[in-house]
């Protein structure tokens, strides 16, 4: 804290410019208003104010907006909101998506910090929802975005927002993610074609249920190896021999790479022998010839 | 993290001249603006020169006409040339920065040069 003192004789501030720099912090604190700190803000990010300094800055703004920032202010912080803590961010209202714009601007390049946490949350609480624009902000600063929310969480996103997810974005999300994410996928890009329709919900498969992997093993659609490891185990195991062949193309001979990883080791287990060797691939550990498989689940239910 | 060494200090008659150096290593590409300080004996350390990434610099009032900052970005050095010195120059002469890391802003100073002038 600094010591309240008076200003020197002729070093009252009159506007906020560069020859502050050069005011002790005392100086600064007592020279400077802060009703013309705030009106003048947009001149504080344009200022090589020093780390000491900033720290009086901040300080002069708390004491005038005790209850949170104006988002006049709050829009030109610049380096001062890497000053500020998660709690004064939570007494922030930011609305505006410049505003949030020029704030992720500041921590480009470093990870998502708590402050940075805390105020996408205040926005996105304001907003209601996550919608497209603050998606596409969101994931361009921070590709794994989308991942650090909660299946609940996610569920506030529309549909028309999934337009904005580039594959890279869903890197580290959960299978609990992706099973939120991927219904509404399917309804973003329903109106597609078959070949469009694949390039776009690719990345958001490892949501999918069966029966969309059955319809899409008719459509010629030759997905990769590295799409389909990433399937749900439960997905996958229904599907027949004819299936995934028809799923993965060409690609249908990395199953043997992947022959002792899921959802491939599973699946396999589940196969009768015969269908495997149709592929030629030397699979082995499917159902031999001759047994008969007995789905106990069924039986469970039934009696 | 940032690393600053200060050199160039020294004993110099009065209307001599020094240059001081401060070499940064590190996380330099995060650096924004370089400050020089100075702390005379008993006196409270006072900003003396700065010079901001985009080269822009100014100084103090005091030392207007007599001290400038420039950098050499390629190694990573920024300079205070100091001319026409006088015994009130004397101080210890710090170099300073901050930058950006993990969310909130990080200070690092230089260990010092000392700078003497003799009348």
């Known amino acids: 804290e600094v010591e309240k003192t008076a200003c020197p004789s002729g070093k009252k501030a009159r506007e906020i410019d560069e020859s502050l720099i050069f005011y002790k912090k005392w100086e600064l604190e007592a020279c400077v208003d802060a009703a013309l700190l705030a009106t003048q803000m947009d001149r504080v990010n344009a200022i090589p104010f020093t780390y000491e300094q900033l720290d009086v800055l901040k300080h002069k703004l708390d004491e005038l907006y005790p209850q949170g920032y104006p988002e006049s202010v709050i829009q030109h912080l610049g380096y001062l909101f890497l000053k500020m803590s998660p709690e004064d961010i939570r007494k922030w209202n930011v609305t505006s998506l410049e505003t949030l714009k020029a704030l992720l601007e500041v921590n480009k390049g470093h990870e998502m910090s708590p402050q940075v946490a805390t105020l996408i949350d205040r926005f996105v609480k304001g907003r209601g929802q996550l919608d497209k624009d603050t998606l596409d902000t969101l994931t361009a600063f921070y590709p794994g975005y989308l991942c650090s929310l909660s299946p609940e969480e996610l569920s506030s996103v529309p549909p028309s927002s999934i337009w904005a997810v580039r594959p890279q974005d869903l890197d580290t999300c959960d299978p609990r993610q992706l099973d939120v994410l991927y219904p509404k996928a399917r309804l973003a890009f329903q109106n597609m074609n078959g070949s469009e329709y694949f390039v776009k919900i690719q990345s958001f498969l490892g949501g999918a249920p069966t029966e969309d992997l059955k319809a899409l093993s008719q459509q010629n659609v030759s997905m990769d190896l590295a799409t389909f490891m990433k399937l749900r185990t439960d997905a996958v195991l229904p599907l027949t021999v004819a299936e995934v062949q028809k799923l993965l193309g060409p690609h249908v001979e990395g199953l043997k790479a992947e022959e002792r990883h899921r959802p491939v080791r599973d699946w396999i287990l589940r196969q009768r022998q015969d269908d495997l060797d149709t592929l030629g691939l030397g699979l082995q550990g499917g159902i031999p010839n001759g047994y008969l498989v007995l789905d106990l689940s069924m039986q469970e239910a039934l009696s | 993290q940032v690393q600053l060494v200060e050199s160039g200090g020294g004993l110099v008659q009065a209307g001599g001249s020094l240059r001081l150096s401060c070499a940064a290593s590190?996380?330099?590409?995060?650096?924004?603006?370089m400050y020089w300080y100075r702390q005379a004996p008993g006196k409270e350390r006072e900003l003396v020169a700065f010079?901001?990434?985009?080269?822009?610099?100014n100084v103090r009032d005091s030392v207007k006409g007599r001290f400038s900052v420039s950098r050499d970005s390629a190694k990573n050095i920024v300079y205070l040339q100091m001319n026409s010195l006088t015994p009130e120059d004397t101080a210890v002469y710090y170099c300073?920065?901050?930058?950006?890391?993990?969310?909130?802003?990080?200070?690092?100073w230089g260990q010092g040069t000392q700078v003497t002038v003799s009348s």
């Open positions: 010079i901001s990434s985009g080269g822009s610099t």
């Open positions: 590190g996380s330099t590409s995060s650096i924004n603006t």
């Open positions: 300073n920065t901050y930058i950006p890391l993990r969310g909130t802003l990080h200070d690092y």
